[in-house]
Structure formats: C-alpha cells, structure tokens
C-alpha cells in the first residue's frame, strides 16, 4: 500500500516534552477497565525521518532479529525485507531462525507504481518497546521489490494494522494485530501519536528525532489534551470513517457529503498527505487560495510539487486557513469536528535550501480512491483505533505543532442530520478491493 505520496511519510518530534504537557480535561466517557492509564514503556517508541515513515522496532525469529518496521494503518500484511537490497542495512534471515515455518505460499502486491513480492511463513514476533509478549504471526518475507523500500528511511518492513479483508493474498491471512489479540490478553485496541517536525530538520536532527508513540492495548493519558471524540468504523477493512462536512477557516465547502467519502474515507498512517477526492480537492484548494489571497503561490505548489520558502522563522502561518473535517459521531444526528493548522498541512522539507530558509510542500493532494487522512491529519491528534468497539477516537495531540494564536482542535457535538447518506456504497465486483496502491 505504498505509493506516490502513500509512502514515504514524515515524522520528527516537536511540541512540549512530556513534563510540559498540558493537563487533560476530565474525559466525559467511561472506559472499560484496564484500557487506559500509563503505558510508559511504549511512549516515544516510534521514530522516523521527514517524509519517510514512522517505524517501530520489532524482533522476529529465534534468536531474535531486530528490524525497524513502518507502522501502516492502511494495509494488513506484516511484510519484511528478507533478501539483500541496496536500501536495506539489514533484513530478515529466515534460515537463521529456528522458529520459522514456511507456509509454502507466495504473495504478490502490486501498487500503482512499484510492487513487492515474497514468500509467506510464520515466526515468533515481539515489540521490545511494546507489550511484554511474543506471538506467532504471519510474515511475508519480501524477496523482490520495486520502489517500495526508501533509501535512508531506516525501516526494513511494514506492519499493516488494518483488517483481514484487505490482507494479501486474501482475507484468510491473519493480520499481526489479530494474532496478537488472539494469543494474549491484550485488549483489542491501539493508539497512535504521530509527532510531526513542524520545521525542517537537518540530517543529524532527523536521524536522532523521536517520532511519537504506538500504544498497544490501550490509551495513554499523557499523550493528549481535552477529551476523546469517537467516530464509528464504517466497515472493517481499511479503517473507514464517514466525513459529513468540510470547512476551510469556518467556511463550509457546501458539497454533497457523499463527495467527501467517494469512494471511501480512511485513516492511514502510511500516507503522508491529506488526500481528497478530485472534486473536493479542487474546491478545498480554491478555498485555501482565497483565504490566503494576500500572497500568491506557484501552481506547482498547490500540486504538491514546488516548495515555497521563507526566511527561517518567518513562515506566515497566519495567512493560511485552518481545515476542519466533521466526522460522524457515535450518537444519532451528532457529529464532531477535527481542525488542523497549516503547521500540519504545510510539510517542512529538509536539506533543500540554505539554513536561512524554511521550505514547505503543500501536503493536501488529489486522490482517485477517496479521502485519506494521512499523517497531515494524524500529526494533529492522538488517534485511538478502538477495534473492540468498532470506533476511532480523536483528541488533540500533546505534541502537535502550533503557534501562539491557533491550536489543532477536536470539538463537538454538532447536530448533523442524515449522516448515513454521506457514505458511498462501492459497487461489489470481484476486483473491488484489488487496487491497493493509492495514486
């Protein structure tokens, strides 16, 4: 599931350190016992470099082989490099693992650009900075790939955290998280705090930067402020949600809400950008341009191609509007909104200009496969993937990048009627889920 702007992604650390995080308001929802609290050993277990993905350290095999694995909520295979590749410093050596079992089955995953293929097997897997368990999981040992691994990204595999329906070669291949929950007492929930850089990092800073947290089995209070608002998972394949309204600086785009979810809307940590269906993208860009009309930017900037630079520290955040997505709430006719700042949707790009400049790419782009709420959205929020209750929660991230005038927000409730009509029903064909790559 990795393409064009699907991967690579971006990361980095910004915002207050743990000790300076704002106190969280009392949550208005009761939670099941054991599902929230402190997960100290998992905090700050993600790293990454700008535009190249958030990864977690995992071990596979016996004795354990350590690999960095990209966290991807937009796919469902656990796949790791298993053969030499110019961009890999290390790879999974099955022959060295006494616990490897060959499934005698191949897997081929093509994308719009590029592909990977490999051999299926199972082995023992653990997450050093995660729950203290070891599980036997399916592993796709990648033996051949094209435009999949990224030079210098520092990850050697991908952890698909979505549902079995989109697993390759078919839905009978149990995804890692399903195996984890089945084989342990870990609750069926995980949460992600992706911490964007917010400013261009030089090579040294980028390599050393902390990227965020993947909390397995629950919710960590310290990672968010305010309350969590939940939206239903519409269907368990991707993490599909329903957007019911879109605003730019409070101005409604006034489109038929079906357009926002054509042909789906998903939450995907493996995509860099906020990707919008063509009609929605065009309307949003028109509105963003109008809101920032005191300055004009080149056409290529709005296409996500050209970079715009300002003298270091002078980026005019105030001229760019906030973007609000209203998501279906858990209560009938109720929605809530998540609001991101230009600090999220203008992506800092490192190593292109002089140290005198801060340069950015516009990280909202056009999609032919629906809305993708990628890192641009996720970096503003603590996102809870509550699989047990078939819902996704959003709260303001304690590490999101903001300024003294505006902050990312999660607000509600709002009255919104006929939200069910906003979902798009994909015509069922044999190939309805075959296009993994999102161009």
């Amino acid at each position: 599931t990795h393409l064009g702007i699907r991967l690579p992604l971006r990361s980095g650390l910004a915002g207050p350190p743990l000790g300076l995080r704002l106190p969280r308001e009392t949550d208005e929802e009761s939670e099941e016992p054991g599902r929230r609290g402190s997960f100290v050993e998992m905090v700050d277990n993600l790293r990454g470099k700008s535009g190249q993905g958030y990864y977690v350290e995992m071990t596979v095999g016996s004795p354990p082989q350590t690999l960095n694995i990209l966290v991807d909520t937009g796919s469902s295979n656990f796949a790791v490099g298993a053969a030499p590749h110019p961009f890999l410093h290390r790879y999974y050596q099955r022959q060295l693992s006494s616990t490897y079992r060959d499934l005698r089955k191949g897997v081929y995953v093509p994308y719009t650009q590029g592909k990977w293929e490999g051999e299926l097997g199972t082995d023992l897997v653990s997450i050093p900075h995660g729950p203290n368990v070891t599980v036997r999981a399916n592993i796709a040992a990648i033996t051949e790939s094209d435009k999949f691994f990224i030079n210098g990204s520092n990850w050697e595999g991908i952890l698909g955290l979505a549902y079995a329906e989109i697993a390759r070669p078919d839905d009978s291949l149990e995804p890692f998280f399903d195996s984890l929950v089945k084989q342990t007492h870990i609750p069926n929930i995980f949460s992600l705090q992706l911490c964007g850089a917010g400013f261009p990092l030089n090579q040294t800073e980028a390599l050393a930067s902390v990227g965020g947290s993947m909390i397995i089995g629950g919710i960590d209070h310290s990672l968010y402020t305010g309350r969590l608002w939940y939206t239903p998972i519409r269907r368990e394949w991707y993490y599909e949600v329903i957007i019911v309204r879109v605003e730019i600086n409070g101005q409604d785009l006034k489109m038929d809400c079906k357009e926002y979810n054509y042909d789906k809307s998903i939450v995907d940590s493996g995509t860099t950008n906020l990707r919008l269906p063509k009609k929605v993208f065009e309307a949003a860009v028109k509105s963003i341009k109008a809101a920032s009309s005191t300055e004009k930017f080149p056409d290529g900037f709005w296409l996500g191609e050209q970079l715009v630079c300002w003298q270091a520290g002078t980026t005019p955040w105030n001229i760019f509007p906030v973007i609000s997505l209203y998501l279906m709430g858990e209560v009938t006719n109720q929605s809530f909104r998540i609001t991101i700042l230009p600090q999220q949707y203008l992506r800092p790009v490192e190593d292109v200009a002089t140290s005198q400049d801060d340069c950015y790419k516009f990280a909202v782009s056009q999609s032919s496969t629906g809305t993708v709420m990628g890192a641009v959205i996720m970096e503003g929020f603590y996102v809870v993937f509550d699989r047990a209750r078939k819902r996704i929660g959003f709260a303001v991230s304690a590490c999101h990048v903001h300024d003294e005038f505006r902050t990312a927000a999660v607000e509600g409730p709002f009255v919104t009627a006929d939200m069910e009509d906003c979902g798009y029903n994909i015509p069922q064909t044999d190939e309805s889920t075959l296009m993994t790559g999102r161009a």
Epitope: K296, P298, G300, E305, L307, D351, V352
Partner: antibody
Framework: QLQLQESGPGLVKPSETLSLTCTVS??????????WGWIRQPPGKGLEWIGN???????YYNPSLKSRVTISVDTSKNQFSLKLSSVTAADTAVYYC????????????WGRGTLVTVSS | EIVLTQSPATLSLSPGERATLSCRAS??????LAWYQQKPGQAPRLLIY???NRATGIPARFSGSGSGTDFTLTISSLEPEDFAVYYC??????????FGGGTKVEIK
C-alpha cells in the same frame, strides 16, 4: 503589449541607498496572474535574483540581500520600486525588472536593464 | 542550497551545427527548470520553461529535455542570432532564486 522600463540614478556613492523604479506600461501591475521582480547582473557575471513583489504588497527577498533590500509597489502609478541600502562596489551591476509569469514561476518578460555604478 | 552547474562554460560552434548545453542540479528539481538566452547588451529572454515547454515566440529549433538533476537545452541548427549566453534557472524552490553560471555559445 506590456513593457517594463527601469529608471533611477546610474551612479550611487558607497554606503548610500540605491533606488530604482520599474514602470509597467501596456497592462496592469494589479493583475492577479503575476509577481514582479528585480534581478541584477554584475559586469561580465551571471544573474542574481534580488526579490519579488505581488500587487498586494507581499514580498520575497533573496536571503543574502534581505537585510538591505526593500521592494514596494504603487498600483496607482503602475510601478514597483527597489531600494538597496549601504551599497558597496560589489553592488555595481545592471539591474533588471521582470515579470514573474507561468504560474508565478518564470521571468517571462524583462525590462532592458539599467547600469548602476557604485563609486565615490 | 540547490546549485546549478552549467557545462561547458563555452561552446564554439559554426552556424548550422547542433548545440547541446547541459545544466546539472545538485539535487532534484523535478521539471521546474527554465532556460534563458542573453545577447550582449540585452536583457535575458525566456526560452524554455518547465524543462521542455517553449515560451511564446521561441523557434522550434530550441528544445529542452530532462528532469530531476540533469537537463539539456538543444539548438538543432544554430542560426547566427543564436550566438549568446544561455542560463538555466530552477524554480523547484520558490520564489525562484537560483541561476546557473551560464554557457557562452560562440562562433567557431
């Protein structure tokens, strides 16, 4: 058709401020399709971008010159201007004004240029 | 900073010959590159934008190619008025700031 014409003193003393004006004729400087810019070329050397301005007054400057440069626009006169302070002999150059078109990216129309010599 | 290196510095050719000028960027600039022609005592003139698109009024003998880091300006058959200095410029980083050092095409 649209034309650009630079004007200003050809000789400036060291430490003083160089001031040039570019007059746009045959079209409006208030067009939303263009930025307007200044580029200079020291004798026998290459081109150096100085800065751009939009009719709203929004400016971008070359970081290496930013502390000394001011570009302004006067839409009523269809003109934009360059001021470069604390000049030295190294600022001796032909100064061009130009229009930044093709999606605000390329200098598609240039003035003829004016030579400014910095000397006492 | 993105540095543009033009080669050769000087190209000595006769009218009717083919001229091939090179511009190399220190890192990828996608296809956001222009070529300008400057004759003695005149202002530069935009020839090519977005690496391969001819500007208005530019003869078909001028063509641009390349993307990423390597770009070429080709003059298929040199006319007497083509002897000039040619500059490349990247606009991948905006506002456009970086010009190459120039290639002088002179009569052999």
């Amino acid at each position: 058709q649209l034309q650009l014409q630079e004007s200003g003193p050809g000789l400036v003393k060291p430490s003083e401020t160089l001031s040039l004006t570019c007059t746009v004729s045959g079209g409006s400087i208030s067009s939303s399709s263009y930025y307007w810019g200044w580029i200079r070329q020291p004798p026998g050397k290459g081109l150096e971008w100085i800065g751009n301005i939009y009719y709203s007054g929004s400016t971008y400057y070359n970081p290496s010159l930013k502390s000394r440069v001011t570009i302004s626009v006067d839409t009523s006169k269809n003109q934009f201007s360059l001021k470069l302070s604390s000049v030295t002999a190294a600022d001796t150059a032909v100064y061009y004004c130009a229009r930044l078109g093709h999606g605000y990216s390329y200098f598609d129309l240039w003035g003829r240029g004016t030579l400014v010599t910095v000397s006492s | 900073e993105i540095v543009l290196t033009q080669s050769p510095a000087t190209l000595s050719l006769s009218p009717g010959e083919r001229a091939t000028l090179s511009c190399r960027a220190s890192q990828s600039v996608s296809s956001y590159l222009a070529w300008y022609q400057q004759k003695p005592g005149q202002a530069p003139r935009l020839l090519i934008y977005d690496a391969s698109n001819r500007a208005t009024g530019i003869p078909a003998r001028f063509s641009g190619s390349g993307s990423g880091t390597d770009f070429t300006l080709t003059i298929s058959s040199l006319e007497p008025e083509d002897f000039a200095v040619y500059y490349c410029q990247q606009v991948y980083l905006w506002p456009p700031r970086t010009f190459g050092g120039g290639t002088k095409v002179e009569i052999k």
